[in-house]
Amino acid sequence: MAVTACQGLGFVVSLIGIAGIIAATCMDQWSTQDLYNNPVTAVFNYQGLWRSCVRESSGFTECRGYFTLLGLPAMLQAVRALMIVGIVLGAIGLLVSIFALKCIRIGSMEDSAKANMTLTSGIMFIVSGLCAIAGVSVFANMLVTNFWMSTANMYTGMGGMVQTVQTRYTFGAALFVGWVAGGLTLIGGVMMCIACRGLAPEETNYKAVSYHASGHSVAYKPGGFKASTGFGSNTKNKKIYDGGARTEDEVQSYPSKHDYV
């Protein structure tokens, strides 16, 4: 039960995280005009990964796409790449984790296969989250660098009379969405990896003892009860009989490891 909950929660958290990464990638507010120097501007500028926008005080908003690839800063291209890789990995991870969910039965898929899929999706979520966090952090670093560079030459005098105010940009809402979303995806991935440990068949749940009978080969399993593990394995102490029968809601099915004489 605990494994199913951990896996389900990991899936939901990752789903929210990936939705957030997609939202952040699409948002226009990666950088917004710093209003510290001009809090009463009638023209507000903000920029995203794909286009830059201007909102006038009337409400009129005009956005222009970056219709060039070669002319864009390498850092921006890198951020785009990181975010896209994060989305792609996250999407694949979601697809894999759907089939890995304990509550979903697909044919006679073994728990070991589900465990492997859970681990795979967990790793994908972790990498996806790291990509998003890295992308957002690279962009934020770029903003900080440009901010202080533009502060250094904030005003360029023209004949001592005219001032040209340089537009400075600060962190936009998309950065915070990206950081939170990346964090959630990362947490979801970790949860999936933890759930995988509970799903995986354990090597030695019990010791099989072999008895050498004179006439027939008989294997006897002492105890009759499966040992309880820390990851939700048979907490109800259901009796496991020699015939190999398993109750349907049992958490794990173990391969038989007996010495036959």
Epitope: Q33, N38, V40, T41, A42, V43, N45, Q47, S52, C53, V54, E56, S57, S58, G59, F60, E62, R64, V162, Q163, T164, V165, T167
Partner: antibody, heavy 119, light 113 residues
Amino acid sequence: EVQLVESGGGLVQPGGSLRLSCAASGFTFSTFGMHWVRQAPGKGLEWVSYITSGESPIYFTDTVKGRFTISRDNAKNSLYLQMNSLRAEDTAVYYCARSSYYGNSMDYWGQGTLVTVSS
Amino acid sequence: DIVMTQSPDSLAVSLGERATINCRSSQSLLNAGNRKNYLTWYQQKPGQPPKLLIYWASTRESGVPDRFSGSGSGTDFTLTISSLQAEDVAVYYCQNAYSYPFTFGGGTKLEIK
């Protein structure tokens, strides 16, 4: 046809108060920002205040800050300018103007209402 | 606040001739985000409210005759009337539309010579 009609002007003593109104028609009032601009007799134009379509934020010229308040009632298609602590230099024709959708400009103006501050 | 300075204060031009009015701002009105200049031109005829002529420094308002044109960028702007008509006699104002408080130039009175 877009129409803006100002009212509420008149003679007032220094330190007194006055409330100007601007009745709008011919357009969807609630979707446009609105300005107040004044013109002293024989002088140039002076922008006074602006209120966005959503009633916030609002802006004022430095000379009227703390004395004038701008408000609007979208249900009544009306714009208001509450003027307190009036001074002689506030004497002017007050125009209400609609903010154009483009360029932060003012595309339609009322005929104006005269405010005279004198003892 | 951005200070708007218009020149000349008054201008007399013959009918059919070109009239040029200048406007200078104390700060650049060019917005880097969209490369637009936030300068507006208005015309005010005697006894009437102002009328919008040009916004974004060079975009004519609908209904404004094409003899009116605006140019310039950054801090220096020009309103040109290519062929003066009798009905163009008015006072012309430039306005900063870039940051609050919006400020107007002192106005240029255009007359017929």
